[in-house]
Interface confidence: low
């Protein structure tokens, strides 16, 4: 069947369209094209006769049409009026007529649209704005974009006039956005430039910053006002109702109490004609004086004197605060505050109470601190210490002893040998000593301020022969798997080698054994019962050697899990039950028994004569070592059968 296809169907003005013929019969007389849906001579465009190969224009020919041998018609430079139906009249060679109709639509190439507005400066919550997409174009579809997004769903947005008009009712500042319209038809789509909606709003209630309303005399007052507004607000400041200046910021240097009052910021929007005000009340406080501390005793004596520290000056209705060592006051029965907190009393001062102490006066804005005060606590002297700790020296060496005692003011020192005063120095030096220098060396420390003296006596032995050493221990009764023990070989002597033996053997290699302090100290970590052996230390130098008496380590251990004997668990009625309990323990444990959970007796042996089946049950032995603080127990079930009922039963003891 003869058909016409329009390529394209939708044609842009100025372009061309091909009316393409399908299924054209083979043998033709000719054909003719007409404008419209029927053959009408008045509307003939062109005719073509095969035989003459002659194309004849008709009344509707415009000069823009070209006819092809296959009967297709090309129309160039399309105009709007070309829209519509076209009919091909084919005369076959047998002069049979055939018609086919095709059509196309012509659309203008759309111009770039623009947006017109009925209100260029709408006022928030008051005005509506109608955007219209220009120009008005037939057969065009209108679309709208807000910030390059399609229109949001909103009851305040309304499309009308075939979507050509977008109305925003009761505009808000949030409607300030980029608006674009787009026109579309089947042959083109064009977007307008964006139009920014300038919504006038505000001023909102202004905010005054900073928020603080309390100031100190002498500070600068710098207030800034801001109100959301379009166009930006014009600002004015009033102080106590008096107009000050028309600026966004109000600056008053070096304020005084007289600057206290109500500060009003007025924001004005010249376009909306609206004014809004915010009031803040500023309070200026007089600067309090810097506090200082007075003391009733500048040189208190430790453990004797009390000290009262007072925060000056005295100001009515003021909160006083105290700090010791930059921290708030610790809770202590020796620290007392007066009712108004202005006086801090230290009862029975100690050397640790030196401070520093600070007091503070709290006002509405801040806390003013005093300068720190340090107490000069007089103390000591404590018992002096003499160093080095050696008590044994070889002849010919130099003896240099130093004495020190904690004291404030620093102690004055004196040395005595065998009760005879030697010199008033902190150090005592004797060169090239002999056996005659052996004796009692006393250091006396004196505190001139407190009048107190303390002494320490040290026995010095000068001998070529080493003395017999002895072993001191830091723990005479260590607990197994818990304690460590440190043995120290005494005395400490110069140029001396220290040696150790365990059960007459040199020290075994063990990670639990450690020598230190020039081998003078032997430490046993995590002692075990196997460490309960004889320990001997020895000292030797190039002249002599000597060994200590043995010290046996008493390791506390246990109680281990007890054993109940005999092991029998079945007895004949009438036999005697004689159970003995034993547990390895040092010291020996305390024993107790329970039968079927009921306490019996605190003995190692449990004896029951002539048992019966009533004596059936669980027999528990409990062991307790008071020294180690450990407990242990074991349970044994005993069955008593009637006489002669069961062979192999024990007759008992």
């Amino acid at each position: 069947k003869l058909t016409i296809e329009s390529t394209p169907f939708n044609v842009a003005e100025g372009k061309e369209v091909l009316l393409l013929v399908h299924n054209l019969p083979q043998h033709l007389f000719g054909y003719s094209w007409y404008k419209g849906e029927r053959v009408d001579g008045n509307r003939q465009i062109i005719g073509y006769v095969i035989g003459t190969q002659q194309a004849t224009p008709g009344p509707a020919y415009s000069g823009r049409e070209i006819i092809y041998p296959n009967a297709s018609l090309l129309i160039q430079n399309i105009i709007q009026n070309d829209t519509g139906f076209y009919t091909l009249h084919v005369i076959k060679s047998d002069l049979v007529n055939e018609e086919a109709t095709g059509q196309f639509r012509v659309y203008p190439e759309l111009p770039k649209p623009s947006i017109s507005s009925n209100n260029s400066k709408p006022v928030e919550d008051k005005d509506a704005v109608a955007f219209t997409c220009e120009p008005e174009t037939q057969d065009a579809t209108y679309l709208w974009w807000v910030n390059n997004q399609s229109l949001p769903v909103s009851p305040r947005l309304q499309l009308s006039n075939g979507n050509r008009t977008l109305t925003l009712f009761n505009v808000t500042r949030n409607d300030t956005a980029s608006y674009k319209c787009e026109t579309q038809n089947p042959v083109s789509a064009r977007r307008s430039d964006s139009v920014i909606l300038n919504v006038l709003y505000g001023p909102d209630a202004p905010t005054i910053s900073p928020l603080n309303t309390s100031y100190r005399s002498g500070e600068n007052l710098n207030l800034s006002c801001h109100a959301a507004s379009n166009p930006p607000a014009q600002y004015s400041w009033f102080v106590n109702g008096t107009f000050q200046q028309s600026t966004q910021e109000l600056f008053i240097p070096n304020i005084t109490v007289n600057n206290s009052g109500s500060y009003t910021c007025q924001a004005h929007n010249s376009d909306t004609g609206l004014n809004r005000t915010t009031v803040t009340t500023i309070t200026v406080y007089a600067e309090p004086p810097k506090p200082f501390i007075t003391s009733n005793n500048s040189n208190p004596v430790e453990d004797e004197d009390a000290v009262a520290l007072t925060c000056e000056p005295e100001i009515q209705n003021t909160t006083y605060l105290w700090w010791v060592n930059n921290q708030s006051l610790p809770v202590s029965p020796r620290l007392q505050l007066s009712n108004d907190n202005r006086t801090l009393t230290l009862l029975s001062v100690t050397r640790n109470d030196v401070g520093p102490y600070e007091c503070g006066i709290q006002n509405e804005l801040s806390v003013d601190h005093s300068d720190p005060v340090i107490l000069n606590v007089l103390y000591g002297p404590d018992d002096p210490t003499i160093s080095p700790s050696y008590t044994y020296y070889r002849p010919g060496v130099n003896l240099s002893l130093s004495c020190h005692a904690a004291s404030n003011p620093p102690a004055q020192y004196s040395w005595l040998i065998d009760g005879n005063i030697q010199q008033h120095t902190q150090e005592l030096f004797i060169s090239n000593i002999t056996e005659k220098n052996s004796g009692l060396y006393t250091c006396q420390a004196n505190n001139s301020a407190s009048g107190h003296s303390r002494t320490t006596v040290k026995t010095i032995t000068v001998s070529a022969e080493l003395p017999k050493p002895s072993i001191s221990s830091n723990n005479s009764k260590p607990v197994e798997d818990k304690d460590a023990v440190a043995f120290t070989c005494e005395p400490e002597a110069q140029n001396t080698t220290y040696l150790w033996w365990v059960n007459g053997q040199s020290l075994p290699v063990s990670p639990r054994l450690q020598l230190s302090n020039g081998n003078r100290t032997l430490t046993l970590f995590n002692v075990t019962r196997n460490d309960a052996r004889a320990y001997v230390c020895g000292i030797q130098n190039s002249v002599s050697a000597n060994r200590s008496d043995p010290v046996t380590l008493d390791v506390l251990y246990g109680p281990d899990t007890p054993i109940i004997s005999p092991p029998d668990s079945s007895y004949l009625s009438g036999a005697n039950l004689n159970l003995s309990c034993h547990s390895a323990s040092n010291p020996s444990p305390q024993y107790s028994w329970r039968i079927n959970g009921i306490p019996q007796q605190h003995t190692q042996v449990l004896f029951i004569a002539k048992i019966t089946p009533n004596n059936n049950g669980t027999y528990a032995c409990f062991v307790s070592n008071l020294a180690t603080g450990r407990n242990n127990s074991i349970v044994k079930s005993i069955t008593v059968s009637a006489s002669g009922t069961s062979p192999g039963l024990s007759a008992g003891a």
Epitope: Q234, T242, F243, T247, S270
Partner: antibody
Framework: EVQLLESGGGLVQPGGSLRLSCAAS????????MGWVRQAPGKGLEWVSS????????SYADSVKGRFTISRDNSKNTLYLQMNSLRAEDTAVYYC??????????????WGQGTLVTVSS | DIQMTQSPSSLSASVGDRVTITCRAS??????LNWYQQKPGKAPKLLIY???SLQSGVPSRFSGSGSGTDFTLTISSLQPEDFATYYC????????FGQGTKLEIK
């Protein structure tokens, strides 16, 4: 019709005092800001002082601060300027003027005819 | 304080001339500027407020413009009654005036 009528000017010795008055009519005086502006002979205008609708809000030019006091009596529709410790440089015509409530901030929209103050020994 | 400087200090012109007087503030005053006219022996009269708004009853030949620091008073066609001294005034605090511009007949 707005009218402002100043009085109280005259000749005064340096260090002396004078009190100017301004009688207002034709508008709601009690709700209007008022001010004084002076003009020395052959010179330009100089703002002197202003007062709010309530007497609590006052402001002064630095040149008169501490010597002049502006006040008002709303019941009498009258504005005053108490001038103490007068100096030769205070010699001027003193105008009373009104600040309207709008526009914002307000200009001086109505002025009196002025009163001459002469400070001379 | 904000200083206001007018220029010129004096100006000679003829009836029908277009005249411009400028006023410069020492710092930005937004649009808070007023213009006044004063004739000898008379009180000043408000012409323009808020830099560009014409006071009621003032002929439309007077116009004002500017914002920030630079402002202008323009008389589009001088009339005989316009010869006077013109003052600008900033409406901040204190309310300082310019030194004045005397407009005389040429």
């Amino acid at each position: 019709e707005v009218q402002l009528l100043e009085s109280g000017g005259g000749l005064v010795q340096p260090g002396g005092s004078l009190r100017l008055s301004c009688a207002a009519s034709g508008f709601t005086f009690s709700s209007s800001y008022m001010g004084w502006v002076r003009q020395a002979p052959g010179k330009g205008l100089e703002w002197v002082s202003s007062i709010g609708s309530g007497s609590y809000s006052t402001s002064y030019a630095d040149s008169v601060k501490g010597r002049f006091t502006i006040s008002r009596d709303n019941s009498k529709n009258t504005l005053y300027l108490q001038m103490n410790s007068l100096r030769a440089e205070d010699t001027a015509v003193y105008y009373c003027a009104r600040y309207p409530s709008v526009p914002f901030p307000p200009p001086l929209d109505y002025w009196g005819q002025g009163t001459l103050v002469t400070v001379s020994s | 304080d904000i200083q206001m400087t007018q220029s010129p200090s004096s100006l000679s012109a003829s009836v029908g001339d277009r005249v411009t007087i400028t006023c410069r503030a020492s710092q930005s005053i937004s649009s808070y500027l007023n213009w006044y006219q004063q004739k000898p022996g008379k009180a000043p009269k408000l012409l323009i407020y808020a830099a560009s708004s014409l006071q009621s009853g003032v002929p439309s030949r007077f116009s004002g413009s500017g914002s920030g620091t630079d402002f202008t008073l323009t008389i589009s066609s001088l009339q005989p009654e316009d010869f006077a001294t013109y003052y600008c005034q900033q409406a901040g605090n204190p309310h300082t005036f310019g030194q004045g511009t005397k407009l005389e007949i040429k």
